[in-house]
Structures are given as C-alpha cells and as structure tokens.
C-alpha cells in the first residue's frame, strides 16, 4: 500500500474513497474523513492537512472539500422536526411531523403535508397496491360473499358467515355492508308455516 | 449571544415601496431561517414568511405573496423584507425573527421591530 | 388551515391570583406549541415552548399543559409585571399565532 502523496502513471488512485488525484502536483493525495476540511492542500513532499469543522457546520463523507457545509434547523414551515441534531459529519436528522408524509422529489423527502386519510365507505375497502406512500386510496366494492360495515381507510371486506358451518341456518342473508344473520333452526317435529 | 437589529421607524408614501433591514450579531444567518411577523396597531401577531439565507429560498403566506420580497445577505449577517405597493392598512410594527439551530422551532431572538407608517 | 383560538380576549386578575389562558387549534396540533408575552412597545418574549417547557429565565410560576386540540398557560402566582398580553403559537405544519389574550391587574 502506498503512503500520499505518491506519484500514480494513470491519474487512478488505489483508494478512491479516501485518497484523489492532485493534478497540480501529479500526485495521489488523502482525503480528508468525515468532520474535516482541507485546511492545506498537498504538495509533492506534503499530505493534505486536514482540520475539524468549525462549530455548526459539518461534512459528511470523506472529501477534499475546502470548507464545510453549514448546518440547517429542520424546517418546520416545509413540516420537519429534528429527529438528531446536526454534528461536525452529519447534518440534522429531520422527519415529517406526526400526521404527515413526505413528498418525494428524486427520491429526496422535499416537504411534508397532512396524510389525507381517505374513508372507505361500508360495501367497500382500499385497493391494495404496491405504492407504499400512496396517499390517495382508491376504494373498490368488496367482491360477491364479501362484506365491509366501517368507514375506514384500511379496514378489509371479510367473508359472508356460513351459517351450516356452524349448525344454524340463515335468517337474512348478507350484503356488500352486512353479514349473513344466522339462527338456530327449527326444532325437529315444529310446524313450518 | 443573539441580536438583532432593526430601524425603529420607516414612513413610506402610498403607491411606493420601503424595505426593512435585520441585522442579526452572535450568530451566522447561514444557520438560521429568518421569518417576519407583522402586529398592526392593537392587534395580534401574524406570521409573514421566511427566507433561507443559505439560498435565497422563501415562503409567505398567500396575503403576502405580492407584497413582500424577502431576500438576505450572508456576507453582512442582514435580511431584508421589501414591501411594495403601499397601504394604509400596511402601517404595522414589523419583526423579524430567527429560528436555529438550538431554537428550530420557536422565535427565542427577536428584533425590536420597525414601525411602518404609511402616509401621504 | 389551522386557526388558534384563545380566549378569554381579556382578562382582569389580582396580585397573587392563580390565571389560566387558553388555547384551542381547530385541529390535533401534538403539543406543537409555543407561549409568548408581550409588553406594550417591546417584542414579544418565548415563555414556553413545546406545550410545558419553561424558557431559560422566565420565572417558574409560569406552566403549560395540554394535548391534541386544547392548551393551557397558567401563572400560579400573578405578578404586577406579568401585566401583558399572551399569545399561543403552534408549529405544527408552519407557524400560527392566536389572537391573544390581554392580562390586566385589578
């Protein structure tokens, strides 16, 4: 393994993550760990001088940044609050408020907004989709045999009780919002009017 | 410690436009939002917008979209809110306010307030 | 939007009353709240913040309470110079301020 700085023929270093290439000086250079900056660029016969960020501000990754990003409150108006505050390598930590999602934006939560909770009617329940952040439920009828008697955003049509299963025959049958009624069947030798 | 400096007094003519300064010491606006809030005479606080000072990013609430621009400048630590198109009903007491890195959520710091007046 | 309703609107209380302030969000705010006095001619002042914690220096006869829509200032010992008016202020989903609450000494 090689020390920096160290000449290199193809302007490839053999730790990318941690070491660059200084054109300058044609030489492979350190880069300096997360919570640092460059405080000296390096020469030929010198490493990369690396200093801790000053107060509120911080780098992330390993880097060969001249400064440091300043640190960010999580932005209540946009619907964040601080989950873990900002360090010398990484910014604060912000999630949506309770009761709120997030809006994507290339896979970046970019605001919050209010979960808009749809009801599902009774004879109806939430399509189930792949779309795990999607707020906008569709509700679709419960299939034949099948009911829903809530209005509610997750609650599933069940299955019509089958009354034979339990030894009991049906008085009424069941809907898209109701369940089968069952009742006991007649006593044997009863008049059926 | 956090301060913030405000003129007391402004008087603008009705149809014209003044702008109002916050120069904040002790702490760098790059950490910070800075919001305004307007009190006009005998009546309670409203909460105006802010401005990102990191990147001229803002938001306002609807009544002041069209009439005030919020802008701020890093190198001087200051922010600015320009108010256009005056009315008398724009005569208030003008705050501005940070939210930090310590106080993300509350206004702990505020300017002493500029009082617009606005006549002709 | 959510409004903040405070009432009373005005409120006359004598030296070492027990005062209670409220204030009413139109919807669940989650103890997103902030208490502020203000002073004829000064700006306002942080007194509580996140529904029950008291500011570094405000006096510890000030408290707050509450949950979901409902919330509670309250001086257990009234001051002369607690003469002023009170606003709530919530930071859930942005900032509101209510329309306050004007204490005067009998």
């Known amino acids: 393994q090689l020390v920096p700085p160290y000449r290199i023929e193809n302007q490839t270093c053999w730790d990318q993550d941690k070491e660059y290439y200084e054109p300058m000086h044609d030489v492979c250079c350190s880069r300096c760990p997360p919570g640092e900056f460059v405080f000296a660029v390096c020469s030929r016969s010198q490493d990369t001088v690396c200093k801790t960020c000053p107060h509120n501000s911080y780098n992330e990754h390993w880097n060969h940044l001249s400064t440091c990003q300043l640190c960010r409150p999580c932005d209540i108006v946009l619907g964040f609050e601080e989950v873990a505050p900002c360090t010398s390598d990484r910014k604060a930590e912000c999630r949506c408020q309770p009761g709120m999602s997030c809006v994507y934006l290339d896979n970046e939560c970019v605001h919050c907004e209010e979960e808009r909770l749809v009801l599902c009617q009774p004879g109806t329940e939430a399509e189930v989709t792949d779309e795990i952040m999607d707020t906008d439920v569709n509700c679709v009828p419960c299939k034949p045999g099948h009911f829903q008697n809530t209005s509610s955003p997750r609650a599933r049509c069940q299955p019509h009780t089958r009354c034979e299963i339990q030894g009991l025959v049906e008085a009424a049958p069941g809907t898209s919002y109701s369940d089968t009624i069952c009742k006991n069947p007649p006593e044997p030798g009863a008049m059926l009017l | 410690e956090v301060q913030l400096q405000q003129y007391g007094a402004e008087l603008g003519k009705p149809g014209t436009s003044v702008k109002l300064s916050c120069k904040v010491s002790?702490?760098?606006?790059?950490?910070?939002?800075i919001h305004w809030v307007i009190q006009r005479p005998g009546k309670g606080l409203e909460w105006i917008g802010r401005?990102?000072?990191?990147?001229?990013?803002?938001i306002s609430t609807e009544k002041f979209k069209n009439k005030a621009t919020l802008t701020a400048d890093l190198s001087s630590n200051t922010a600015y809110m320009q108010l256009s198109q005056l009315k008398s009903d724009d005569t208030a007491i003008y705050f501005c306010?940070?939210?930090?890195?310590?106080?993300?959520?509350?206004?702990?710091?505020w300017g002493q307030g500029t009082l617009v007046t606005v006549s002709s | 939007d959510i409004q903040m309703t405070q009432s009373p609107s005005q409120l006359s209380a004598s030296v070492g009353d027990r005062v209670t302030l409220s204030c009413k969000a139109s919807?669940?705010?989650?103890?997103?709240l902030n208490w502020y006095q203000q002073k004829l001619g000064e700006a306002p002042r942080l007194l509580i913040y996140?529904?029950?914690i008291l500011q570094t220096g405000i006096p510890s006869r000030f408290s707050g309470s509450g949950s979901g829509t409902d919330y509670t200032l309250t001086i257990s010992s009234l001051q002369p110079e607690d003469a002023a008016t009170y606003f709530c202020?919530?930071?859930?989903?942005?900032?509101?301020f209510g329309s306050g609450t004007k204490l005067e000494m009998k």
């Open positions: 306010a940070p939210t930090t890195l310590t106080t993300p959520d509350s206004f702990a710091y």
């Open positions: 002790g702490y760098n606006i790059g950490n910070t939002y």
């Open positions: 401005i990102d000072p990191t990147n001229g990013n803002t």
């Open positions: 919807q669940n705010i989650y103890k997103y």
């Open positions: 996140s529904t029950n």
């Open positions: 202020q919530k930071y859930y989903s942005g900032f509101t």
